[in-house]
């Protein structure tokens, strides 16, 4: 067979689906690799071919589209399972070709089992809700295209193991779940199960997501530098180790990049000819406010180093702040035998 542009195994698309549920999987060629869509390809006389490699096998085989009740079918650029079976797990390849052109890509499909409380090896999307912010909604994800708009599915929402009913602040509203006001206690896994009929059969779609309640933008402030501050003086003798922590609190801000850095005499530590190391640690509150600590360390400080300016800087989407550390050379305590005696006029 002639050459084929092989995009390899697209591990970015690690598709996970539940056993015994419908799954519709679009050929990734048109979404990520080619600059034209399926309709254009089809009208240009290109054919889309599917095949697969079973889990723990090397042999590529055609997909059996003649199973009872059309369990596996293809529609345009979509591969359909109605429903999946555990042994459908494997690497699937879609190939677009005619006599002069060929392009293909493979992707892994994993069929997973869930337990009675919807726990599974499935990687869960995280949805962030602002604490005490007013009405916010989550929507049952990835259910588009499974049934026509004329079909009215039933949707049941669960928190963990339990149907959501008679909750004070959480109300199921069809495909949406409304949080009248979100609290830390609303953290957890939420599952929607969509049930719909098709050709005399009933199908179910289970979708679980993790809700994380985070700090509200109403309460967000610019970065706050707790250390260094005006109450602490770093007094060292030459030869001692100088350790200065820069501790900064950042309010949670969606998609904000929090940055902390030191300058020494207005320059980055890397641009100064001294042996300085900086260690960073990060901790988070329950609402994902962040505290970053960067410890500036000079193992054996010189008297020159003790004259320098050490400034901690911090930046977030809310603003930029800076604070200088007060660094001094320790004045040696007087030695009695010489200095004190001289002071008393001894000869």
């Amino acid at each position: 067979s002639e050459r084929c542009d092989d995009w390899g195994l697209d591990t970015m698309r690690q598709i996970q689906v539940f056993e015994d549920e419908p799954a519709r999987i679009k050929c990734p060629l048109f979404e990520h690799f080619l600059k034209f869509n399926y309709s254009t390809a089809h009208s240009a006389g290109l054919t889309l071919i599917w095949y697969w490699t079973r889990q723990d096998r090397d042999l590529e085989e055609p997909i059996n589209f003649r199973l009872p009740e059309n369990r596996i079918s293809k529609e345009k650029d979509v591969l359909w399972f109605r429903p999946t079976l555990l042994n459908d797990t494997g690497n699937y390849t879609c190939m677009l070709r005619n006599t002069t052109y060929c392009s293909k890509v493979a992707f892994p499909l994993e069929v997973v089992q869930k337990d009675s409380c919807f726990n599974s090896p499935m990687k869960l999307p995280v949805h962030k809700l602002y604490i005490e912010y007013g009405i916010q909604r989550i929507t049952c994800p990835n259910v588009d295209g499974y049934f026509p708009s004329s079909v009215k599915p039933t949707i049941t929402w669960y928190m963990g193991c339990y149907k959501i009913q008679n909750f004070n602040n959480v109300i199921p509203e069809g495909m949406n779940l409304s949080f009248l006001i979100a609290f830390i206690s609303n953290n957890g896994n939420y599952t929607c199960v969509v049930t719909y009929p098709e050709n005399g059969r009933t199908f179910h779609l289970t979708r679980t997501l993790t809700v994380k309640v985070v700090g509200s933008p109403k309460n967000a402030v610019p970065p706050v530098i707790h250390s260094p501050n005006d109450h602490v003086v770093y007094e060292k003798e030459p030869g001692e180790e100088l350790l200065i922590p820069c501790t900064v609190y950042f309010s949670f801000l969606m998609d904000s990049r929090n940055e902390v850095w030191w300058t020494i005499d207005g320059k980055k530590p890397d641009d100064i000819p001294i042996d300085v190391t900086i260690n960073e640690s990060i901790s988070h509150s329950r609402t994902e406010d962040e505290t970053r600590t960067q410890i500036l360390s000079i193992k054996k400080v010189t008297s020159e180093d003790l004259k320098r300016s050490y400034v901690c800087h911090a930046r977030s989407a809310k603003g930029e702040v800076a604070k200088a550390a007060t660094v001094k050379q320790k004045v040696p305590a007087p030695r009695y035998t010489v200095e004190l005696a001289c002071g008393f006029g001894a000869t």
């Epitope: 015994d20 429903p83 079976l85 089992q113 869930k114 337990d115 009675s116 149907k163 179910h204």
Partner: antibody, heavy 117, light 107 residues
Framework: QVQLVQSGAEVKKPGSSVKVSCKAS????????MNWVRQAPGQGLEWMGR????????HYAQKFQGRVTLTADKSTSTAYMELSSLRSEDTAVYYC??????????WGQGTLVTVSS | DIQMTQSPSSLSASVGDRVTITCSAS??????LNWYQQKPGKAPKLLIH???GLHAGVPSRFSGSGSGTDYTLTISSLQPEDVATYYC?????????FGGGTKVEIK
């Protein structure tokens, strides 16, 4: 298509036990609840309990707690209901009913258990 | 346990009639209500789930409605094959409980 085939009718003595089987096919046995419901002659339906074969999680009606045991064998896709300390009022048709969620979508044909001395 | 009360316990209607069966719960069940049909000597069959969701393959003459504690099953045009006993069942709170049943006959 979903099929639930139950074991045959049983005649039991008071104080003994009965074990009814329900063999499932046409769906993923591990991923659905298997319920057990009974119906005394000429009476209504009474839910006894359910099991999730995937993890063995069970829920029982208080009335049957301690007297009924639900089990499932994933290798043969078979669910079992064992009822002990039988009395005459346990004479009934016992049904298994499969449900992906809580509704019982599909039912077995029923097993008549007669308790008589 | 939640008590389910069905009425009437039996009814007789003519072919083509509109038939209504009601089911009342002892407390709110948030639409978590199923309707089953049981023909003589047969196992029950699911007709409607979650108050109004028609189970696959069930004729559209069957419909369900209601909220809170009160629910209704309607057969818009009674057919001879609809002769059966109909049960409501709540699945809001364990244990699941059934109504006493409504026997539907043809006049």
């Amino acid at each position: 298509q979903v099929q639930l085939v139950q074991s045959g009718a049983e005649v039991k003595k008071p104080g003994s036990s009965v074990k009814v089987s329900c063999k499932a096919s046409g769906y993923a046995f591990s991923s659905s609840w298997m319920n057990w419901v009974r119906q005394a002659p000429g009476q209504g339906l009474e839910w006894m309990g359910r099991i999730y074969p995937g993890d063995g999680n069970t829920h029982y009606a208080q009335k049957f707690q301690g007297r009924v045991t639900l089990t499932a064998d994933k290798s043969t896709s078979t669910a079992y209901m064992e009822l002990s300390s039988l009395r005459s009022e346990d004479t009934a048709v016992y049904y298994c009913g499969e449900g992906y969620l809580d509704p019982m979508d599909y039912w077995g044909q029923g097993t008549l258990v007669t308790v008589s001395s | 346990d939640i008590q389910m009360t069905q009425s009437p316990s039996s009814l007789s209607a003519s072919v083509g009639d509109r038939v209504t069966i009601t089911c009342s719960a002892s407390q709110g069940i948030n639409n978590y209500l199923n309707w089953y049909q049981q023909k003589p000597g047969k196992a029950p069959k699911l007709l409607i789930h979650y108050t109004s969701g028609l189970h696959a393959g069930v004729p559209s003459r069957f419909s369900g409605s209601g909220s809170g504690t009160d629910y209704t099953l309607t057969i818009s045009s009674l057919q001879p094959e609809d002769v059966a006993t109909y049960y409501c069942q709540q699945y809001s709170i364990l244990p699941w409980t059934f109504g006493g049943g409504t026997k539907v006959e043809i006049k």
